[in-house]
């Protein structure tokens, strides 16, 4: 994973394939973005602490007709143990700020990188 070389997991056990694929997909989205992602659609900003996978899915699932993030939406469902439907919001949502999908993806990616640096992956 050359694009992840700067923040490899410090522990001896590598992160799961699923997580590696999610990060790769987020990297691909940010790198391959030419036109405004999802036509500049806005989504709720989320609390990037506990429950971020479910919260991220809840936020992104409200974006429809955007093929660029469909794979991300499918991947996130594998990280959230709950059933998530459009229009649903958990108590962990900030829900006072909307940001563009492109910024949302960048924020999520940066947070996952931070967690890697802190060694929070088994």
């Amino acid at each position: 994973l050359t694009c992840l070389g700067g923040f490899a997991s410090p522990g001896p056990v590598p992160p799961s394939t699923a997580l590696r694929e999610l990060i790769e997909e987020l990297v691909n989205i940010t790198q391959n973005q030419k036109a405004p992602l999802c036509n500049g659609s806005m989504v709720w900003s989320i609390n990037l602490t506990a429950g971020m996978y479910c919260a991220a899915l809840e936020s992104l699932i409200n974006v429809s007709g955007c093929s660029a993030i469909e794979k991300t939406q499918r991947m996130l469902s594998g990280f959230c143990p709950h059933k998530v439907s459009a229009g649903q919001f958990s108590s962990l949502h900030v829900r006072d700020t909307k940001i563009e999908v492109a910024q949302f993806v960048k924020d999520l990616l940066l947070h996952l990188k931070k967690l890697f640096r802190e060694g929070q992956f088994n």
Partner: antibody, heavy 117, light 104 residues
Framework: QVQLVQSGGGVVQPGRSLRLSCAAS????????MHWVRQAPGKGLEWVAI????????YYADSVKGRFTISRDNSKNTLYLQMNSLRAEDTAVYYC?????????????WGQGTMVT | EIVLTQSPATLSLSPGERATLSCRAS??????LAWYQQKPGQAPRLLIY???NRATGIPARFSGSGSGTDFTLTISSLEPEDFAVYYC???????????FGPGT
Amino acid sequence: QVQLVQSGGGVVQPGRSLRLSCAASGFTFSSYGMHWVRQAPGKGLEWVAIIWYDGSNKYYADSVKGRFTISRDNSKNTLYLQMNSLRAEDTAVYYCARLWFGDLDAFDIWGQGTMVT
Amino acid sequence: EIVLTQSPATLSLSPGERATLSCRASQSVSSYLAWYQQKPGQAPRLLIYDASNRATGIPARFSGSGSGTDFTLTISSLEPEDFAVYYCHQRSSWPPIFTFGPGT
């Protein structure tokens, strides 16, 4: 009333099997991730397993991996724990617990517990 | 694997006093931390999630704080029903592996 009612505990010989059940009511069971947690006599809490709302993903503690299987039947609002190749160190009170909605790190509803000896 | 250490193991206090319970993680768990109360013969009860948020129905005398590796549960003024075992609890970011502290 939101509750989890457990059954299936008992005394079993080492090497044998046992299945625990956890019947949910008062909430939409099929929308929630669920757990099993255990507590050996006089000891602390030990997480055992988690299952996704639709059964698509399951994760286990190393101590039970390959021996225990978590499953669910959403049509019956019931969570199960199939325990095979039981050992003396599996003796504990077993709790089923609901995962806090939208979160991975908190269990907000617990069953009453069932003893496995 | 992240290990949680709770201190003190036993805290001897009287009703009306302030209780301060500590939970330390062997490595950063950000704010992925919860606190539970357990009384003899009963199932645990969720008190605090995400390090500092009180669960539904939990009295205001219970508060949680901390992030990274050091966390604290404070009971501002002990009521008779607060005498119990308290566990801290965390999960790894991925895969979801859960760990409890030994209890106070």
